[in-house]
Interface confidence: medium
């Protein structure tokens, strides 16, 4: 038996920020798990991790120099990623398990997200117009 | 046919350290949660490490944060607990046990590895 995870097929962080949900099937209220948002096609760098726990607090961190938070629904978590790079442009997979109560759970792998990040360009300013032309 | 095989146990001194291992056959671990369970005469039964799943999360009893770690490795089908900074309160018998079904309950056992740390 495994959870169902949905995400937005794509997202464009333009101020170099973006909030992914992962929506389940699965209502996460009192449970113990683990929520990570994976990088890549081979989710080989875990960005961020969100973990519950029924009777604590939540816990968010990243291991990998991602700026992130977490947020909890009962049948979602997202993820609030900032000082994104346009280098991190890539597919992100939503991951869950479930180690309480029994039996363990996790998901099937997900579509993905693709997370386009746009770089900051800077526009030239009208107070300080381009040399005019005699 | 589930079974598991815990190896490891022995005579330590007070500060020393030893390597359980748990053999799982029958299924596979990174589809549960594996368990280092231990009893001592005269003291309650106690979950002292537990991992989960193929991402590996685990808990800790209190009394052994920071000296024990678990792990395992999914190719083996093996589970792992690390004791180190070993105090005579260790001494008992570990247990490896698999798939939960009610917290701290679990279906399956392994027959035991016994610690004993005096010096």
């Known amino acids: 038996n495994k959870i169902l995870v949905k995400q937005s097929p794509m997202l464009v962080a333009y101020d170099n920020a973006v909030n992914l949900s992962c929506k389940y099937s699965y209502n996460l209220f009192s449970r113990e798990f683990r929520a990570s948002l994976h990088k890549g096609l081979d989710s080989a760098v875990e960005v961020c991790v969100v973990y519950g726990n029924y009777s604590q607090q939540l816990q968010v961190y990243s291991k990998t120099g991602f700026n992130c938070d977490g947020k909890l629904g009962n049948e979602s978590v997202t993820f609030y990623l900032q000082n994104l790079y346009v280098n991190q442009t890539d597919i992100y997979f939503c991951k869950i398990e479930v180690m309480y109560p029994p039996p363990y759970l996790d998901n099937e792998k997900s579509n993905g997200t693709i997370i386009h990040v746009k770089g900051k360009h800077l526009c030239p300013s009208p107070l300080f117009p381009g040399p005019s032309k005699p | 046919e589930v079974q598991l095989v815990e190896s490891g146990g022995g005579l330590v001194q007070p500060g020393g350290s030893l390597r359980l291992s748990c053999a799982a056959s029958?299924?596979?671990?990174?589809?549960?949660?594996i368990g280092w369970v231990r009893r001592a005469p005269g003291k309650e039964e106690e979950l002292v490490a537990r991992?989960?799943?193929?991402?590996?999360?685990?808990r800790y009893a209190d009394s052994v944060k920071g000296r024990f770690t678990i792990s395992a490795d999914t190719s083996k089908n093996t589970a792992y607990l690390q004791m180190n900074s070993l105090r005579a309160e260790d001494t008992a018998v570990y247990y490896c046990?698999?798939?939960?079904?009610?917290?701290?309950?679990?279906?399956?056992w392994g027959q035991g590895t016994t610690v004993t740390v005096s010096s």
């Open positions: 991992i989960c799943g193929e991402y590996g999360s685990t």
């Open positions: 046990a698999a798939q939960p079904r009610y917290y701290d309950v679990y279906d399956y």
């Open positions: 029958g299924f596979n671990i990174k589809d549960t949660c």
